[in-house]
């Protein structure tokens, strides 16, 4: 039993490097120590992420990929370990780091928020739906007036640079719009967003943020809402939102507003139709919104309301399409 052998020495890995391989993504790589005796034994490695956020894990491989913001730098350590049923032997640590990029903290963007929407694909024969991305941010409080910001996103192995910006009064980019992206809003991979900047007066500190596509996906409003009045009943029907998710993946909320007395009736539904009793002297406003439900993914936020449809009073039988 090697672990009980007093003279058995575990040597640390060698050639430990940390390399940025993409936006908010690093590759840690090391080699087994060439001087390690008994190299046929089952050696493992204990990796410790020291910054920007502490984490640790064991691996049998000699490399490890980490997805994490890099604007504050990145530091990690690794050591060789040998496990048995009752004890673990460990070598000393070796460490490496990526320095934080230059720039004072107050120059980087703040309050970065991003949302995605499903849109019709430009290549419908390949896949019918794609995802649009909109991000907004605030200019850093210490950023010079001539600062210009540039946004990039990475999803999986694909990276794109923003081409369509909104600007503030000083012509600085403060929002970005991608009409179509490579993002899969059904996936579990994280979306990495990186904003760097330039100025003649100061070094602008970059900023990275990771988003869960599920968390930032904004469900479109239900389509083709139709309303019909027939003998004091309101027949309301709609189609699922524009989405890659099928019909059964949606829950709905229906809002019927009586404009005469101000009463609001709200219904949570799993069906795409509803019948409601009404009086014949009021006008009603009808809106529907959708959310992706639990059979298909973690329940998401409610999407946007459909445009209101007004029925009632003189409009005895009306069908409107939106």
């Amino acid at each position: 039993d090697l672990l009980n052998h007093k003279k058995f020495l575990l040597l640390p890995p060698v050639n430990f490097t940390i390399k940025a391989t993409g936006l908010a993504q690093v590759l840690l790589h090391w080699d087994p120590n060439p001087d390690q005796e008994q190299r046929h034994v089952d050696l493992e490695y204990h990796v410790k992420i020291n910054a920007p956020q502490e984490d640790e894990y064991d691996t049998r491989k000699t490399e490890s990929k980490c997805v994490t913001p890099l604007h504050e730098g990145f530091a990690a350590s690794v050591r060789t370990i040998l496990k048995s049923s009752h004890t673990t032997l460990a070598s000393s640590w070796v460490s490496a780091e990526l320095k934080a990029p230059p720039g004072s903290p107050g120059t980087s963007v703040t309050n970065l928020t991003c949302t995605t929407h499903t849109v019709v694909s430009s290549h419908t024969h390949l896949r019918p739906y794609q995802v649009s991305l909109r991000c907004t941010w605030l200019v850093g409080k210490d950023a010079p007036e001539d600062t210009q910001y540039f946004l990039y996103y990475r999803f999986g192995v694909l990276t794109e640079k923003c081409q369509e910006y909104s600007r503030d009064a000083l012509n600085r980019n403060t929002a970005c719009w991608f009409p179509r992206t490579f993002i899969n809003s059904k996936g579990f991979e994280q979306l990495a967003v990186h904003i760097n900047g330039s100025s003649k007066r100061a070094a602008i500190k970059p900023f990275d943020q990771l988003f869960s596509p599920l968390a930032i996906d904004q469900v479109n409003p239900p389509r083709n809402v139709t309303v019909e009045i027939e003998s004091n009943s309101l027949y309301i029907q709609w189609e699922k939102p524009l989405s890659a998710f099928p019909d059964h993946c949606f829950n709905y909320e229906l809002k019927i507003y009586n404009t005469k007395n101000g009463h609001i009736q709200k219904e949570k539904l799993i069906a795409n139709k509803f019948i409601s009793k009404i009086d014949d002297v009021s006008t009603y406003s009808i809106q529907v919104r959708a959310a992706v439900s639990s059979p298909c993914r973690m329940p998401g936020r409610w999407g946007e309301w459909s445009q209101p449809i007004y029925v009632g009073k003189e409009r005895k039988s009306l069908v409107e399409w939106h």
Partner: antibody, heavy 124, light 107 residues
Framework: EVQLQQSGAELGKPGTSVKLSCKVS????????IHWVNQRPGKGLEWIGR????????IYAEKFKNKATLTADTSSNTAYMQLSQLKSDDTAIYFC?????????????????WGQGASVTVSS | DIQMTQSPASLSASLGETVTIECRTS??????LAWYQQKPGKSPQLLIY???SLHTGVPSRFSGSGSGTQYSLKINSLQSEDVASYSC?????????FGSGTKLEIK
Amino acid sequence: EVQLQQSGAELGKPGTSVKLSCKVSGYNIKNTYIHWVNQRPGKGLEWIGRIDPANGNPIYAEKFKNKATLTADTSSNTAYMQLSQLKSDDTAIYFCAMHRGHSMGPGPYVMDAWGQGASVTVSS
Amino acid sequence: DIQMTQSPASLSASLGETVTIECRTSEDIYNGLAWYQQKPGKSPQLLIYNANSLHTGVPSRFSGSGSGTQYSLKINSLQSEDVASYSCQQYSNYPFTFGSGTKLEIK
């Protein structure tokens, strides 16, 4: 209680048509979909199509597009299926089915209430 | 159309045993799967919807599981009244499609 009452057994000659009915009591069919399913002797279930009684829009499985015609009459709360150009392999039991609306539970795509089935025999 | 591959076609088990029926789909159906029980000469009855939700009034010895393209129905502690045919059905995409059915018998 929701009930789906189907018309009786039909005996049809090859090339002719039959029309089956499904009367729903205890639920307004405008608030659901009516599905039709068949089962040939000794075989499994087969989805024929569904109709949305609120607007009369049907959806058919490809193989039944020129075979079945789905309609609904909301005033009598009844759905119908006409089978045309009958052949011997149309011999089967035909079920109507629907979902009873709930605010939770299965959506209108799941069949949780069924008719008793109507036997159609095609023979010369 | 989404193809449904149900197995086994038939199975025989003893009272009190646990049995499992599998259903594989040709593409991801996002848990849009129902299981039905049909006793001889009767109409089908809904057991499970959304792959794993037990329909009202169905005994808890029935359970559904799975995701993506692989789903299963499990019957714990088999009873004599469970003799029937069992079918899976996907409602993720039109046209809806059924599995070929599994005939369950008691040994």
